[in-house]
Interface confidence: low
């Protein structure tokens, strides 16, 4: 299990390193993104973990950002981030149905209402359980 | 009404043990981070630990492996452990709520506890 | 990692003046920090979340400002009941911390 585990985040911050670099290839990060939505968490160990990653890197104010599966619904008021950036990424993951193109990809300033807490835990304890 | 109340401050030896309690009201420990701090007398605020919704915690580096935080979703209620207690460890200790999004501050706060660490 | 610095540790002011406290972090923390009042004997209280976000209750004569390493906190005309210790504290990151607070601000009367 131990090595499972180890796998595990091997792979996971495998693919939060290559996020969205190759739009041909997007199995894992929808598996990743279905994690992040469903354990409403946000990274491996913490929600920084994306702000490493070049493809979610602009410029300046917004140099921080992460995928919309790490933004938490239930906290927000802003409709307009709502029904334009967020709703419409959450769906697909929703219904895990069309595989996502590159230009889908969908990141919100990390300033908004992100996850507190990486998925490790919880990905952790759902191997424990299982 | 949303409310923390601590209890289990006191005196205690140098070296010794003690466990703070927190018992929350009028929301569920298990959807939140929730957080110890302590205020040595006539001193700042300082950060203890934290425990995640999921149950994954931090500590300050200073409380690793002396402190230990936990709690039990049925009782709704938060604990500190803290062992080999030093006279530096006198302070009131509070339990904050911080919540679930990254961002949210520490509200609201218990009264606090006083522990006290001398011979 | 992620230390606070806060500034001045003491400011002398009377009812009605214009008083700044700042906190300077030392990595850029975006803008999660808070702000808290506490006075002697109580439990602080969240004035201010989100760097600029005033907290429920709150009256408006507080303001937060700032981003990245720099923050203000801002009473546009000093009351009565203002006259307390004011902290900062950082909500960026929990892991490898010494503290996540600024080291306090008192506010006292001049």
């Known amino acids: 299990r131990a090595q499972l585990e180890r796998s595990l985040r091997d792979v996971v911050e495998k693919t939060i390193q290559k996020y969205g670099t190759n739009p041909e290839e997007t199995a894992a990060e929808e598996s990743w993104d279905y994690v992040q939505f469903q354990l409403r968490c946000c990274g491996w160990h913490y929600p920084q973990d994306w702000f490493q990653v070049l493809i979610l890197r602009g410029n300046g104010s917004e140099a921080h950002r992460v995928p919309c599966s790490c933004y938490n619904l239930s906290a927000t008021n802003d409709s307009t981030i709502l029904d334009k950036v967020i709703l419409p990424q959450l769906s697909r993951l929703g219904h895990l149905a069309r595989s996502r193109h590159s230009a889908d990809i969908c990141a919100v300033p990390a300033e908004s209402h992100i996850y507190r807490e990486g998925c490790a835990q919880g990905l952790q304890k759902w191997l424990h359980n299982n | 009404e949303v409310q923390l109340v601590e209890s289990g401050g006191g005196l205690v030896q140098p070296g010794g043990s003690l466990r703070l309690s927190c018992a929350a009201s009028g929301f569920s420990l298990s959807y939140n981070a929730m957080n110890w701090v302590r205020q040595a007398p006539g001193k700042g605020l300082e950060w203890v630990s934290i425990i995640f919704a999921s149950g994954r915690t931090d500590y300050a580096s200073w409380a690793k492996g002396r402190f230990t935080i936990s709690r039990d979703n049925s009782k709704n209620t938060l604990y500190l452990q803290m062992n080999s207690l030093r006279a530096e460890d006198t302070a009131v200790y509070y339990c904050a709520r911080e919540g679930s999004t990254w961002g949210d501050a520490l509200d609201p706060w218990g009264q606090g506890t006083l522990v006290t660490v001398s011979s | 990692a992620y230390d606070m610095t806060q500034s001045p540790s003491t400011l002398s002011a009377s009812v009605g003046d214009r008083v700044t406290i700042t906190c300077q972090a030392s990595?850029?923390?975006?803008?999660?920090l808070a702000w808290y009042q506490q006075k002697p004997g109580k439990a602080p209280k969240l004035l201010i979340h989100?760097?600029?976000t005033l907290a429920s209750g709150v009256p408006s004569r507080f303001k937060g400002s700032g981003s990245g390493t720099e923050f203000t906190l801002t009473i546009s005309s000093l009351q009565p009941d203002d006259f307390a210790t004011y902290y900062c504290q950082q909500g960026y990151s929990n892991s490898n911390i010494d503290n996540t607070f600024g080291g306090g601000t008192k506010v006292e009367i001049k």
């Open positions: 989100k760097a600029s």
């Open positions: 990595q850029n923390i975006i803008d999660y």
